[in-house]
Protein backbone atom coordinates (compact mmCIF):
# COMPACT_ATOMS: atom_id res chain seq x y z
CA UNK A 1 0.00 0.00 0.00
CA UNK A 2 1.65 3.30 -1.07
CA UNK A 3 1.70 6.42 1.04
CA UNK A 4 -0.28 9.18 -0.63
CA UNK A 5 -1.09 12.87 -0.42
CA UNK A 6 -4.23 14.08 -2.20
CA UNK A 7 -5.14 17.72 -2.74
CA UNK A 8 -8.71 18.61 -3.65
CA UNK A 9 -9.26 22.28 -4.53
CA UNK A 10 -12.40 23.94 -5.84
CA UNK A 11 -12.98 27.50 -7.06
CA UNK A 12 -16.30 29.02 -8.07
CA UNK A 13 -17.58 31.59 -10.53
CA UNK A 14 -20.91 33.41 -10.58
CA UNK A 15 -22.20 34.91 -13.82
CA UNK A 16 -18.72 34.70 -15.31
CA UNK A 17 -17.00 36.38 -12.37
CA UNK A 18 -14.50 34.26 -10.45
CA UNK A 19 -15.21 34.29 -6.70
CA UNK A 20 -12.46 35.30 -4.29
CA UNK A 21 -12.44 32.28 -1.98
CA UNK A 22 -11.59 28.66 -2.58
CA UNK A 23 -12.29 25.31 -0.97
CA UNK A 24 -9.45 22.96 -0.19
CA UNK A 25 -9.09 19.58 1.46
CA UNK A 26 -6.00 17.43 1.80
CA UNK A 27 -6.02 13.67 2.45
CA UNK A 28 -2.99 11.85 3.78
CA UNK A 29 -2.97 8.08 3.22
CA UNK A 30 -6.69 8.30 2.45
CA UNK A 31 -7.52 10.06 5.72
CA UNK A 32 -8.98 13.58 5.91
CA UNK A 33 -5.90 15.54 6.96
CA UNK A 34 -6.24 19.27 6.32
CA UNK A 35 -8.85 21.71 5.16
CA UNK A 36 -8.54 25.38 4.37
CA UNK A 37 -10.48 27.59 6.77
CA UNK A 38 -11.45 30.57 4.61
CA UNK A 39 -12.56 32.72 7.50
CA UNK A 40 -9.28 32.35 9.35
CA UNK A 41 -7.01 32.02 6.30
CA UNK A 42 -5.45 28.89 7.72
CA UNK A 43 -4.81 25.29 6.81
CA UNK A 44 -6.49 23.46 9.66
CA UNK A 45 -5.70 19.91 10.81
CA UNK A 46 -8.64 17.51 10.68
CA UNK A 47 -8.67 15.85 14.06
CA UNK A 48 -6.09 15.06 16.71
CA UNK A 49 -4.15 12.57 14.59
CA UNK A 50 -3.53 15.29 11.97
CA UNK A 51 -2.33 17.64 14.72
CA UNK A 52 0.03 14.90 15.85
CA UNK A 53 1.54 14.42 12.38
CA UNK A 54 3.40 17.72 12.56
CA UNK A 55 3.65 18.01 16.32
CA UNK A 56 4.40 21.60 17.26
CA UNK A 57 4.55 22.94 13.70
CA UNK A 58 2.25 25.84 12.88
CA UNK A 59 0.91 24.66 9.48
CA UNK A 60 2.41 27.85 8.06
CA UNK A 61 3.82 26.13 5.01
CA UNK A 62 0.60 24.23 4.34
CA UNK A 63 -1.38 27.47 4.59
CA UNK A 64 0.87 29.20 2.08
CA UNK A 65 0.84 26.23 -0.30
CA UNK A 66 -2.95 26.00 -0.32
CA UNK A 67 -3.32 29.78 -0.70
CA UNK A 68 -0.98 29.74 -3.70
CA UNK A 69 -2.72 26.76 -5.28
CA UNK A 70 -6.13 28.40 -4.79
CA UNK A 71 -4.86 31.55 -6.49
CA UNK A 72 -3.53 29.53 -9.45
CA UNK A 73 -6.81 27.66 -9.85
CA UNK A 74 -8.81 30.92 -9.78
CA UNK A 75 -6.63 32.22 -12.61
CA UNK A 76 -7.26 29.02 -14.56
CA UNK A 77 -11.03 29.34 -14.09
CA UNK A 78 -10.87 32.94 -15.32
CA UNK A 79 -9.52 31.61 -18.64
CA UNK A 80 -12.38 29.19 -19.24
CA UNK A 81 -14.38 30.89 -21.95
CA UNK A 82 -17.71 29.08 -21.90
CA UNK A 83 -18.83 30.27 -18.47
CA UNK A 84 -22.49 31.03 -18.78
CA UNK A 85 -24.80 32.61 -16.25
CA UNK A 86 -25.14 31.18 -12.82
CA UNK A 87 -22.78 29.17 -10.65
CA UNK A 88 -19.86 27.17 -12.06
CA UNK A 89 -17.04 25.27 -10.42
CA UNK A 90 -13.51 24.26 -11.37
CA UNK A 91 -12.04 21.47 -9.30
CA UNK A 92 -8.48 20.21 -9.30
CA UNK A 93 -7.48 16.92 -7.71
CA UNK A 94 -3.79 16.29 -7.39
CA UNK A 95 -2.34 13.07 -6.02
CA UNK A 96 1.21 11.99 -5.34
CA UNK A 97 2.26 8.57 -4.09
CA UNK A 98 5.39 6.96 -2.71
CA UNK A 99 5.46 3.18 -3.12
CA UNK A 100 7.28 0.61 -1.02
CA UNK A 101 10.06 0.32 -3.61
CA UNK A 102 10.46 4.12 -3.32
CA UNK A 103 9.05 4.72 -6.79
CA UNK A 104 6.71 7.70 -7.11
CA UNK A 105 3.55 8.47 -9.04
CA UNK A 106 1.78 11.77 -9.54
CA UNK A 107 -1.41 12.68 -11.33
CA UNK A 108 -3.69 15.62 -11.73
CA UNK A 109 -7.35 15.88 -12.75
CA UNK A 110 -9.52 18.87 -13.63
CA UNK A 111 -13.33 18.89 -13.33
CA UNK A 112 -15.70 21.57 -14.57
CA UNK A 113 -19.13 21.58 -12.92
CA UNK A 114 -18.25 18.14 -11.55
CA UNK A 115 -17.37 16.65 -14.96
CA UNK A 116 -13.83 15.39 -15.64
CA UNK A 117 -12.34 17.12 -18.67
CA UNK A 118 -8.56 16.87 -18.30
CA UNK A 119 -6.09 14.50 -16.64
CA UNK A 120 -2.33 14.43 -16.52
CA UNK A 121 0.16 11.72 -15.66
CA UNK A 122 3.06 13.83 -14.45
CA UNK A 123 5.78 11.20 -14.95
CA UNK A 124 4.93 10.66 -18.63
CA UNK A 125 3.68 14.24 -19.14
CA UNK A 126 0.67 12.66 -20.85
CA UNK A 127 -2.59 14.58 -20.90
CA UNK A 128 -5.87 12.70 -21.32
CA UNK A 129 -9.15 14.26 -22.42
CA UNK A 130 -12.54 12.47 -22.43
CA UNK A 131 -14.30 12.16 -25.80
CA UNK A 132 -17.19 14.60 -25.21
CA UNK A 133 -17.06 17.82 -27.20
CA UNK A 134 -17.58 19.90 -24.06
CA UNK A 135 -14.58 18.25 -22.40
CA UNK A 136 -12.50 18.82 -25.55
CA UNK A 137 -13.38 22.53 -25.58
CA UNK A 138 -12.70 22.99 -21.88
CA UNK A 139 -9.43 21.08 -22.12
CA UNK A 140 -8.32 23.22 -25.04
CA UNK A 141 -9.12 26.37 -23.05
CA UNK A 142 -7.12 25.23 -20.06
CA UNK A 143 -4.25 23.75 -22.07
CA UNK A 144 -3.94 26.99 -24.04
CA UNK A 145 -3.84 28.99 -20.82
CA UNK A 146 -1.25 26.65 -19.35
CA UNK A 147 0.78 26.78 -22.58
CA UNK A 148 0.87 30.57 -22.69
CA UNK A 149 4.28 30.25 -21.15
CA UNK A 150 5.08 26.62 -21.93
CA UNK A 151 8.41 26.39 -20.14
CA UNK A 152 7.09 28.17 -17.09
CA UNK A 153 4.09 25.85 -17.05
CA UNK A 154 6.20 22.73 -17.39
CA UNK A 155 8.44 23.95 -14.60
CA UNK A 156 5.41 24.93 -12.54
CA UNK A 157 3.72 21.54 -12.76
CA UNK A 158 6.89 19.59 -12.12
CA UNK A 159 7.66 21.87 -9.17
CA UNK A 160 4.12 21.43 -7.89
CA UNK A 161 4.41 17.65 -7.89
CA UNK A 162 7.94 17.78 -6.51
CA UNK A 163 6.48 19.89 -3.69
CA UNK A 164 3.72 17.33 -3.17
CA UNK A 165 6.25 14.51 -2.86
CA UNK A 166 8.52 16.64 -0.69
CA UNK A 167 5.62 17.38 1.67
CA UNK A 168 4.63 13.71 1.77
CA UNK A 169 8.21 12.68 2.56
CA UNK A 170 8.40 15.36 5.23
CA UNK A 171 5.25 14.05 6.90
CA UNK A 172 6.53 10.47 6.73
CA UNK A 173 9.96 11.34 8.11
CA UNK A 174 8.88 13.74 10.83
CA UNK A 175 5.88 11.89 12.07
CA UNK A 176 5.87 9.01 14.49
CA UNK A 177 2.11 8.98 13.83
CA UNK A 178 2.68 7.67 10.30
CA UNK A 179 5.25 5.11 11.42
CA UNK A 180 3.18 3.79 14.27
CA UNK A 181 1.52 0.38 14.46
CA UNK A 182 -1.96 0.26 15.97
CA UNK A 183 -3.41 -3.25 16.19
CA UNK A 184 -7.07 -3.66 15.26
CA UNK A 185 -9.89 -4.27 17.68
CA UNK A 186 -11.70 -7.33 16.31
CA UNK A 187 -15.34 -7.98 17.04
CA UNK A 188 -17.41 -10.94 15.77
CA UNK A 189 -21.21 -10.73 15.69
CA UNK A 190 -23.98 -13.02 14.46
CA UNK A 191 -27.43 -12.35 13.10
CA UNK A 192 -30.26 -14.61 11.89
CA UNK A 193 -30.39 -14.98 8.13
CA UNK A 194 -32.83 -17.42 6.53
CA UNK A 195 -34.14 -20.50 8.27
CA UNK A 196 -31.28 -22.68 9.46
CA UNK A 197 -28.64 -20.10 8.45
CA UNK A 198 -26.93 -17.29 10.28
CA UNK A 199 -24.74 -14.43 9.04
CA UNK A 200 -21.50 -13.97 10.94
CA UNK A 201 -19.66 -10.65 10.62
CA UNK A 202 -16.10 -9.95 11.66
CA UNK A 203 -15.25 -6.27 12.14
CA UNK A 204 -11.75 -4.86 12.54
CA UNK A 205 -11.50 -1.26 13.67
CA UNK A 206 -9.03 1.40 14.84
CA UNK A 207 -5.99 -0.09 13.08
CA UNK A 208 -2.98 1.49 11.38
CA UNK A 209 -1.45 1.16 8.84
CA UNK A 210 -4.16 0.35 6.33
CA UNK A 211 -2.97 -3.07 5.12
CA UNK A 212 -4.91 -5.90 6.74
CA UNK A 213 -5.99 -9.46 6.04
CA UNK A 214 -9.41 -10.39 7.35
CA UNK A 215 -11.00 -13.66 6.30
CA UNK A 216 -13.30 -16.41 7.53
CA UNK A 217 -11.91 -19.91 8.06
CA UNK A 218 -13.71 -23.22 8.38
CA UNK A 219 -11.79 -25.88 10.30
CA UNK A 220 -8.70 -23.72 9.92
CA UNK A 221 -8.97 -23.39 6.12
CA UNK A 222 -9.82 -20.04 4.49
CA UNK A 223 -13.21 -19.92 2.78
CA UNK A 224 -13.27 -19.25 -0.93
CA UNK A 225 -13.52 -15.64 -2.02
CA UNK A 226 -17.01 -15.96 -3.46
CA UNK A 227 -18.52 -17.22 -0.19
CA UNK A 228 -17.48 -14.09 1.69
CA UNK A 229 -18.51 -10.45 1.52
CA UNK A 230 -15.90 -7.78 2.23
CA UNK A 231 -16.32 -4.16 3.20
CA UNK A 232 -13.91 -1.53 1.97
CA UNK A 233 -11.04 -0.52 4.23
CA UNK A 234 -12.22 2.95 5.23
CA UNK A 235 -10.80 5.77 7.34
CA UNK A 236 -12.65 6.16 10.61
CA UNK A 237 -11.77 9.82 11.07
CA UNK A 238 -9.24 9.25 13.86
CA UNK A 239 -6.26 8.50 11.66
CA UNK A 240 -7.02 4.77 11.78
CA UNK A 241 -9.06 2.40 9.59
CA UNK A 242 -11.95 -0.03 9.78
CA UNK A 243 -13.23 -2.91 7.66
CA UNK A 244 -15.38 -6.03 7.88
CA UNK A 245 -15.94 -9.45 6.33
CA UNK A 246 -19.14 -11.51 6.52
CA UNK A 247 -20.27 -15.00 5.52
CA UNK A 248 -23.37 -17.18 5.87
CA UNK A 249 -23.09 -20.45 7.80
CA UNK A 250 -25.38 -23.23 8.99
CA UNK A 251 -26.77 -22.85 12.48
CA UNK A 252 -25.13 -25.27 14.89
CA UNK A 253 -21.79 -25.25 13.06
CA UNK A 254 -20.55 -22.01 14.60
CA UNK A 255 -17.68 -23.70 16.45
CA UNK A 256 -16.10 -24.74 13.11
CA UNK A 257 -15.70 -21.11 11.99
CA UNK A 258 -13.16 -18.50 13.02
CA UNK A 259 -12.28 -15.06 11.78
CA UNK A 260 -8.58 -14.80 10.91
CA UNK A 261 -6.87 -11.42 11.14
CA UNK A 262 -3.35 -10.49 10.09
CA UNK A 263 -1.95 -6.99 10.54
CA UNK A 264 1.63 -5.67 10.66
CA UNK A 265 3.10 -9.16 11.16
CA UNK A 266 0.69 -10.08 13.97
CA UNK A 267 -2.22 -12.46 13.57
CA UNK A 268 -5.11 -13.73 15.65
CA UNK A 269 -8.23 -15.87 15.33
CA UNK A 270 -11.65 -15.02 16.70
CA UNK A 271 -14.48 -17.50 17.28
CA UNK A 272 -18.18 -16.98 16.61
CA UNK A 273 -19.97 -16.14 19.87
CA UNK A 274 -22.44 -18.80 20.91
Amino acid sequence: EPHSLRYNLTVLSWDGSVQSGFLAEVHLDGQPFLRYDRQKCRAKPQGQWAEDVLGNKTWDRETRDLTGNGKDLRMTLAHIKDQKEGLHSLQEIRVCEIHEDNSTRSSQHFYYDGELFLSQNVETEEWTVPQSSRAQTLAMNVRNFLKEDAMKTKTHYHAMHADCLQELRRYLESSVVLRRRVPPMVNVTRSEASEGNITVTCRASSFYPRNITLTWRQDGVSLSHDTQQWGDVLPDGNGTYQTWVATRICQGEEQRFTCYMEHSGNHSTHPVPS
Partner: antibody, heavy 118, light 107 residues
Framework: QVQLQQPGAELVRPGASVKLSCKAS????????MNWMKQRPGQGLEWIGM????????RLNQKFKDKATLTVDKSSSTAYMQLNSPTSEDSAVYYC???????????WGQGTSVTVSS | DILLTQSPAILSVSPGARVSFSCRAS??????IHWYQQRTNGSPRLLIK???ESISGIPSRFSGSGSGTDFTLSINSVESEDIADYYC?????????FGAGTKLELK
Protein backbone atom coordinates in the same frame (compact mmCIF):
# COMPACT_ATOMS: atom_id res chain seq x y z
CA GLN B 1 -6.82 53.44 7.95
CA VAL B 2 -6.08 50.54 10.25
CA GLN B 3 -5.55 51.55 13.87
CA LEU B 4 -5.01 49.64 17.11
CA GLN B 5 -5.47 51.84 20.15
CA GLN B 6 -3.99 50.85 23.49
CA PRO B 7 -3.89 52.82 26.75
CA GLY B 8 -0.44 54.27 27.41
CA ALA B 9 0.12 52.92 30.92
CA GLU B 10 -1.35 50.85 33.74
CA LEU B 11 -0.18 50.75 37.35
CA VAL B 12 -1.08 47.44 38.98
CA ARG B 13 -0.83 46.10 42.53
CA PRO B 14 0.91 42.69 42.84
CA GLY B 15 -1.67 39.91 42.68
CA ALA B 16 -4.46 42.18 41.38
CA SER B 17 -5.43 41.11 37.86
CA VAL B 18 -5.43 43.73 35.12
CA LYS B 19 -7.27 43.72 31.79
CA LEU B 20 -5.45 45.43 28.92
CA SER B 21 -7.49 46.65 25.94
CA CYS B 22 -6.79 47.02 22.24
CA LYS B 23 -9.46 48.82 20.22
CA ALA B 24 -9.37 48.10 16.49
CA SER B 25 -10.66 50.36 13.73
CA UNK B 26 -10.33 50.78 9.97
CA UNK B 27 -10.82 47.11 9.07
CA UNK B 28 -13.12 44.13 9.60
CA UNK B 29 -12.27 43.17 13.17
CA UNK B 30 -13.67 39.62 12.92
CA UNK B 31 -11.58 38.75 9.84
CA UNK B 32 -8.08 38.88 11.31
CA UNK B 33 -6.21 37.19 14.13
CA MET B 34 -5.08 39.44 16.95
CA ASN B 35 -1.73 38.70 18.61
CA TRP B 36 -0.27 39.88 21.91
CA MET B 37 3.43 40.43 22.67
CA LYS B 38 5.43 41.29 25.79
CA GLN B 39 8.58 43.43 25.84
CA ARG B 40 10.49 44.00 29.04
CA PRO B 41 12.63 47.16 29.30
CA GLY B 42 15.70 46.91 27.09
CA GLN B 43 14.78 43.37 25.99
CA GLY B 44 13.38 41.55 22.99
CA LEU B 45 9.82 40.57 22.15
CA GLU B 46 7.93 37.55 23.45
CA TRP B 47 4.82 36.18 21.77
CA ILE B 48 2.02 35.59 24.30
CA GLY B 49 -0.74 34.27 22.07
CA MET B 50 -3.40 34.97 19.46
CA UNK B 51 -7.18 35.08 19.24
CA UNK B 52 -9.57 35.09 16.28
CA UNK B 53 -12.45 37.46 16.98
CA UNK B 54 -14.94 35.53 14.82
CA UNK B 55 -15.28 32.70 17.34
CA UNK B 56 -12.63 33.46 19.99
CA UNK B 57 -10.42 30.55 18.94
CA UNK B 58 -7.23 31.05 20.95
CA ARG B 59 -3.66 29.82 20.74
CA LEU B 60 -1.47 30.56 23.76
CA ASN B 61 2.25 30.25 24.33
CA GLN B 62 2.43 27.55 27.04
CA LYS B 63 4.70 29.82 29.03
CA PHE B 64 1.76 32.23 29.49
CA LYS B 65 -1.09 29.72 29.86
CA ASP B 66 -1.70 30.59 33.52
CA LYS B 67 -0.68 34.22 33.17
CA ALA B 68 -2.72 35.53 30.23
CA THR B 69 -6.37 35.23 29.25
CA LEU B 70 -7.36 36.51 25.78
CA THR B 71 -10.90 37.66 25.00
CA VAL B 72 -12.69 39.90 22.48
CA ASP B 73 -15.77 42.07 22.40
CA LYS B 74 -17.06 42.03 18.82
CA SER B 75 -19.60 44.81 19.43
CA SER B 76 -16.85 47.32 20.28
CA SER B 77 -14.12 45.73 18.07
CA THR B 78 -11.90 45.42 21.10
CA ALA B 79 -9.45 42.69 22.06
CA TYR B 80 -8.48 42.17 25.69
CA MET B 81 -5.68 40.47 27.53
CA GLN B 82 -6.08 39.83 31.23
CA LEU B 83 -2.88 39.40 33.24
CA ASN B 84 -3.56 37.09 36.15
CA SER B 85 -1.80 37.40 39.55
CA PRO B 86 0.77 39.92 38.31
CA THR B 87 4.24 40.10 39.85
CA SER B 88 7.19 42.40 39.17
CA GLU B 89 8.22 39.98 36.38
CA ASP B 90 5.12 41.08 34.49
CA SER B 91 6.22 44.72 34.38
CA ALA B 92 6.67 45.31 30.65
CA VAL B 93 5.18 46.92 27.56
CA TYR B 94 2.39 44.81 26.05
CA TYR B 95 1.56 45.15 22.36
CA CYS B 96 -1.42 43.95 20.39
CA UNK B 97 -0.81 43.34 16.68
CA UNK B 98 -3.01 42.33 13.79
CA UNK B 99 -1.98 39.42 11.62
CA UNK B 100 -1.97 40.19 7.89
CA UNK B 101 -1.22 36.75 6.50
CA UNK B 102 -0.23 33.59 8.29
CA UNK B 103 1.71 34.67 11.39
CA UNK B 104 2.99 38.02 10.04
CA UNK B 105 2.09 41.11 12.05
CA UNK B 106 1.44 44.17 9.92
CA UNK B 107 -0.25 46.61 12.31
CA TRP B 108 0.81 47.11 15.92
CA GLY B 109 -0.71 49.10 18.74
CA GLN B 110 1.41 51.70 20.55
CA GLY B 111 1.76 49.37 23.51
CA THR B 112 0.61 49.60 27.12
CA SER B 113 3.31 49.99 29.73
CA VAL B 114 2.37 47.89 32.76
CA THR B 115 4.08 48.56 36.07
CA VAL B 116 3.48 46.09 38.88
CA SER B 117 4.23 47.78 42.17
CA SER B 118 2.85 48.05 45.65
CA ASP C 1 11.06 26.37 21.46
CA ILE C 2 12.94 27.61 18.42
CA LEU C 3 15.84 29.82 19.43
CA LEU C 4 16.66 32.68 17.06
CA THR C 5 20.18 34.04 17.51
CA GLN C 6 20.77 37.50 16.07
CA SER C 7 24.25 38.84 15.48
CA PRO C 8 25.92 41.11 16.10
CA ALA C 9 24.14 42.65 19.09
CA ILE C 10 25.16 46.13 17.92
CA LEU C 11 26.08 47.32 14.42
CA SER C 12 27.79 50.67 13.88
CA VAL C 13 27.61 52.02 10.35
CA SER C 14 28.18 55.17 8.36
CA PRO C 15 25.29 56.71 6.42
CA GLY C 16 25.13 55.36 2.87
CA ALA C 17 26.87 52.11 3.78
CA ARG C 18 25.40 48.67 3.12
CA VAL C 19 24.58 46.69 6.25
CA SER C 20 23.50 43.11 6.92
CA PHE C 21 21.82 41.61 9.98
CA SER C 22 22.08 37.90 10.70
CA CYS C 23 19.47 35.62 12.24
CA ARG C 24 20.21 31.95 12.87
CA ALA C 25 17.50 29.44 13.86
CA SER C 26 18.15 26.50 16.17
CA UNK C 27 16.55 24.19 13.60
CA UNK C 28 15.23 24.25 10.04
CA UNK C 29 12.34 26.68 9.71
CA UNK C 30 12.03 26.68 5.89
CA UNK C 31 11.51 30.35 4.90
CA UNK C 32 9.19 31.16 7.80
CA ILE C 33 11.13 34.18 9.03
CA HIS C 34 9.92 37.77 9.24
CA TRP C 35 11.83 40.97 10.01
CA TYR C 36 10.69 43.95 12.10
CA GLN C 37 12.13 47.39 12.81
CA GLN C 38 11.56 49.11 16.16
CA ARG C 39 12.62 52.69 16.59
CA THR C 40 13.24 54.11 20.08
CA ASN C 41 9.94 54.35 22.01
CA GLY C 42 8.04 53.08 18.97
CA SER C 43 6.17 49.93 18.00
CA PRO C 44 7.65 47.26 15.75
CA ARG C 45 7.07 47.63 12.00
CA LEU C 46 7.02 44.71 9.55
CA LEU C 47 9.80 45.05 6.94
CA ILE C 48 10.10 41.65 5.22
CA LYS C 49 7.93 38.53 5.40
CA UNK C 50 8.84 34.94 4.60
CA UNK C 51 12.58 35.61 4.39
CA UNK C 52 12.51 37.66 1.18
CA GLU C 53 9.01 38.94 0.38
CA SER C 54 8.73 42.72 0.36
CA ILE C 55 6.02 44.65 2.20
CA SER C 56 4.02 47.46 0.65
CA GLY C 57 5.21 50.87 1.86
CA ILE C 58 8.63 49.64 2.98
CA PRO C 59 11.55 51.33 1.14
CA SER C 60 13.21 49.14 -1.50
CA ARG C 61 16.59 49.47 0.22
CA PHE C 62 15.40 46.74 2.63
CA SER C 63 15.78 43.17 1.39
CA GLY C 64 15.94 39.70 2.90
CA SER C 65 17.37 36.32 2.01
CA GLY C 66 17.99 32.84 3.38
CA SER C 67 16.19 29.59 4.12
CA GLY C 68 16.54 26.69 6.51
CA THR C 69 18.51 28.05 9.46
CA ASP C 70 20.44 31.10 8.19
CA PHE C 71 18.75 34.37 7.30
CA THR C 72 19.91 37.88 6.43
CA LEU C 73 18.26 41.28 6.38
CA SER C 74 20.11 43.87 4.32
CA ILE C 75 19.87 47.64 3.97
CA ASN C 76 21.73 48.62 0.85
CA SER C 77 22.25 52.29 1.74
CA VAL C 78 21.64 53.18 5.37
CA GLU C 79 19.78 56.40 6.14
CA SER C 80 19.56 58.14 9.51
CA GLU C 81 15.90 57.12 9.88
CA ASP C 82 17.01 53.45 9.85
CA ILE C 83 18.57 53.80 13.30
CA ALA C 84 16.54 51.30 15.31
CA ASP C 85 16.45 47.79 16.72
CA TYR C 86 15.84 44.96 14.24
CA TYR C 87 14.12 41.71 15.20
CA CYS C 88 13.58 38.45 13.35
CA UNK C 89 10.53 36.27 14.11
CA UNK C 90 9.85 32.67 13.11
CA UNK C 91 6.43 31.20 12.33
CA UNK C 92 7.23 27.57 11.60
CA UNK C 93 6.80 26.20 15.12
CA UNK C 94 4.72 26.94 18.19
CA UNK C 95 5.31 29.09 20.06
CA UNK C 96 6.16 31.90 17.66
CA UNK C 97 9.51 33.30 18.78
CA PHE C 98 11.58 36.45 18.21
CA GLY C 99 15.32 36.98 18.19
CA ALA C 100 16.92 39.18 20.87
CA GLY C 101 17.47 41.92 18.29
CA THR C 102 20.33 43.86 16.72
CA LYS C 103 20.76 47.55 17.46
CA LEU C 104 21.79 49.68 14.48
CA GLU C 105 23.65 52.87 15.34
CA LEU C 106 25.48 55.52 13.34
CA LYS C 107 29.26 55.86 13.58
Amino acid sequence: QVQLQQPGAELVRPGASVKLSCKASGYSFTSYWMNWMKQRPGQGLEWIGMIHPSDSETRLNQKFKDKATLTVDKSSSTAYMQLNSPTSEDSAVYYCAREMGPYTLDYWGQGTSVTVSS
Amino acid sequence: DILLTQSPAILSVSPGARVSFSCRASQNIDTSIHWYQQRTNGSPRLLIKYASESISGIPSRFSGSGSGTDFTLSINSVESEDIADYYCQQSNYWPLTFGAGTKLELK
